[in-house]
């Protein structure tokens, strides 16, 4: 549906509040270093312009594309060259190349200060003094640190953020009310950002077909009663939404997401019986709820898959007629029967099936050739099952912190060239799979664990892509999206790695560690553990465990000492010497 003015169209569809919020997110995700005030100024200028177009769609420049309008606006920033260096060269390009150029310069790990949470009273005063600015600042700070955050979902987070302050700043104990809510929003926000980053990586690095395959599998698990044609329609629409958001087209994305939610709710009966509650909610909550909705019950008496996909004499004929449709149907049928499988496993099975048909449909006796294709699935299914069983066993034995440490050692040995902060961050997140998924019964463990691991390993991939240091990481990240986790799992110790020189400063600790939060203290100890493995990659787990136990005792002892700093200095030297002897450093 062509509109004379795209900007007027989106302003009317979304309303002024959402329009302004989405433009702010878009600008902050592109120009991540710009001050808040500069972005607000740009957003206000764009909004005023949009209003003139609403009043008269034929007014000057109103017929320009959003990319042209937004790009022109971003290119007016005076300090572009000083602040962003070569990104300023984007402004010499024409659309669509200019937008592609901006997208390529999005930074997954921007050099920004950590967000420090002020005192509750300070936050409440700021909230009451200027609610609008306070909430805009939230959008800005999240968007610039998470340049692929799913914009319409960020509006939902902002709504909850506002609700938390509205409620808690009036409470008797403001802190007790507010802090747990903010912690929850922070943790959920990080998870949401990482999940969306995988969707964007899937689209940008592996293409639309890869994303659509993922969507077919996931939606078929979620809506097993829906017909294939219905699932296909939802997949097409969902792909459009995420392509837009990942491409920086946030107004179109939010608009299309609202349309998709509307469609799903109008067609609940042919989609899922679990949507009723979601569809009674306001728009932002509704969209979020649909995205998180539990899997519907599988239809009773689904026939065996073998009839249509192995035993039928028309398999090759059906495949040849429309390859992707036939593979899509296979994936749909397999996924709706297997909510107990991870999406990535389902995609591996579909790939195996596709490879077999490619080979067998060209053979003398195709049926004889593909008759045993389902037997090839067994080892593919058992591999993640075994891995999850083993790691949950270790998690239950160790608890989260020590389980993270085991993963830190494991991944540092596999890819020791990766920076220590990245190894710590990724391994800590990998370790959270234990608390998140091991509590589930068998039928829910694999989809929980393996699909979560895909999200975390994508973090490693995008961080590594910015500064590539390991051919093994590059290989696992780029060869196959669905085989990333098995690729990393299969890595043994990197025999080519030259151990890092010993540096006493790396293992020198001070009394300030005693005042850190438990989480920060863990990160300090885990940083030391990674450095230890980088110095001594051949150290056994028993050796490392002994050193870490001694280290924990040392920190505990010195934090209880009267003269903490002296204790850290003297006992620290002894600990380093003992560790060197134990590990033969």
């Amino acid at each position: 549906d062509a509109h004379k003015s795209e900007v007027a169209h989106r302003f009317k569809d979304l309303g002024e509040e959402n329009f302004k919020a989405l433009v702010l997110i878009a600008f902050a995700q592109y120009l991540q270093q710009c001050p808040f005030e500069d972005h607000v100024k740009l957003v206000n200028e764009v909004t005023e312009f949009a209003k003139t177009c609403v009043a008269d769609e034929s007014a000057e420049n109103c017929d320009k594309s959003l990319h042209t309008l937004f790009g022109d606006k971003l290119c007016t920033v005076a300090t572009l060259r000083e602040t962003y260096g070569e990104m300023a060269d984007c402004c010499a390009k024409q659309e669509p190349e200019r937008n592609e150029c901006f997208l390529q310069h999005k930074d997954d790990n921007p050099n920004l200060p950590r967000l420090v949470r002020p005192e509750v009273d300070v936050m409440c005063t700021a909230f009451h003094d200027n609610e609008e600015t306070f909430l805009k600042k939230y959008l800005y700070e999240i968007a610039r640190r998470h340049p692929y955050f799913y914009a319409p979902e960020l509006l939902f987070f902002a709504k909850r953020y506002k609700a938390a302050f509205t409620e808690c700043c009036q409470a008797a104990d403001k802190a007790a009310c507010l802090l747990p809510k903010l912690d929850e929003l922070r943790d959920e926000g990080k998870a949401s950002s990482a999940k969306q980053r995988l969707k964007c990586a899937s689209l940008q690095k592996f293409g639309e077909r890869a994303f659509k395959a993922w969507a077919v599998a996931r939606l078929s698990q979620r809506f097993p009663k829906a017909e294939f044609a219905e699932v296909s329609k939802l997949v097409t629409d969902l792909t459009k939404v995420h392509t837009e958001c990942c491409h920086g087209d946030l107004l179109e994305c939010a608009d299309d997401r609202a349309d998709l939610a509307k469609y799903i709710c109008e067609n609940q009966d042919s989609i899922s019986s679990k949507l009723k509650e979601c569809c009674e909610k306001p728009l932002l909550e509704k969209s979020h709820c649909i995205a998180e909705v539990e899997n519907d019950e599988m239809p009773a008496d689904l026939p065996s898959l073998a009839a249509d996909f192995v035993e039928s004499k028309d398999v090759c004929k059906n495949y040849a007629e429309a390859k992707d449709v036939f593979l899509g149907m296979f994936l749909y049928e397999y996924a709706r029967r297997h909510p107990d499988y991870s999406v990535v496993l389902l995609l591996r099975l579909a790939k195996t099936y596709e490879t077999t048909l490619e080979k067998c449909c060209a053979a003398a006796d195709p049926h004889e050739c593909y008759a045993k294709v389902f037997d090839e699935f067994k080892p593919l299914v058992e591999e993640p099952q075994n891995l999850i069983k083993q790691n949950c066993e270790l998690f239950e034995q160790l608890g989260e912190y020590k389980f993270q440490n085991a993963l830190l050692v494991r991944y540092t040995k596999k890819v020791p060239q990766v920076s220590t902060p990245t190894l710590v961050e990724v391994s800590r997140n990998l370790g959270k799979v234990g608390s998140k998924c091991c509590k589930h019964p068998e039928a829910k463990r694999m989809p929980c664990a393996e699909d979560y691991l895909s999200v975390v390993l994508n973090q490693l991939c995008v961080l590594h892509e910015k500064t590539p240091v390991s051919d093994r990481v590059t290989k696992c990240c780029t060869e196959s999206l669905v085989n990333r986790r098995p690729c990393f799992s299969a890595l043994e110790v990197d025999e080519t790695y030259v151990p890092k020189e010993f540096n006493a400063e790396t293992f020198t600790f001070h009394a300030d560690i005693c005042t850190l939060s438990e989480k920060e203290r863990q990160i300090k100890k885990q940083t030391a553990l990674v450095e230890l493995v980088k110095h001594k990659p051949k150290a056994t787990k028993e050796q490392l465990k002994a050193v870490m136990d001694d280290f924990a005792a040392f920190v505990e002892k010195c934090c209880k000492a009267d003269d903490k700093e002296t204790c850290f200095a003297e006992e620290g030297k002894k600990l380093v010497a003992a560790s060197q002897a134990a590990l033969g450093l």
Partner: nanobody, 124 residues
């Protein structure tokens, strides 16, 4: 420390059987998982089978599933690998290894202690 010594290797015809043993001494063997790895001539070391510390979970490489059986006898501080329907591609040096987590991982670097290996040759 745990010391591991493998035995039972030798020359066998295709289709034949062998039983490898792994004798452990030193620390309490029952707290460790046990694994068998092999290194075929001119190739990397590869996982064959493992058994966790309690003996209730066993894992096998796809290439040996249904032909090899891993077991342990903690009273004797022994581990075993029963190999049947042997093929020429099973020819390798077989190593026994102990894992302090007690899990029985697939990756060799997860194992703290290793034996020196025993040669298995399958040939007619």
């Amino acid at each position: 420390q745990v010391q591991l010594v493998e035995s039972g290797g030798g020359l066998v015809q295709p289709g034949g059987s062998l039983r490898l043993s792994c004798a452990a001494s030193g620390r309490i063997f029952s707290t460790y998982a046990m694994g068998w790895f092999r290194q075929p001539p001119g190739k990397e070391r590869e996982f064959v089978a493992s058994i966790n510390r309690s003996g209730d979970s066993t894992y096998y490489a796809d290439s040996v599933k249904g032909r090899f059986t891993i077991s342990r006898d903690d009273a004797k501080n022994m581990g075993y690998l029963q190999m049947s329907s042997l093929k020429p591609e099973d020819t390798a040096v077989y190593y026994c290894a102990a894992d302090s987590d007690g899990i029985g991982w697939f990756n060799s670097f997860e194992y703290d202690y290793w034996g020196r290996g025993t040669q298995v040759t399958v040939s007619s």
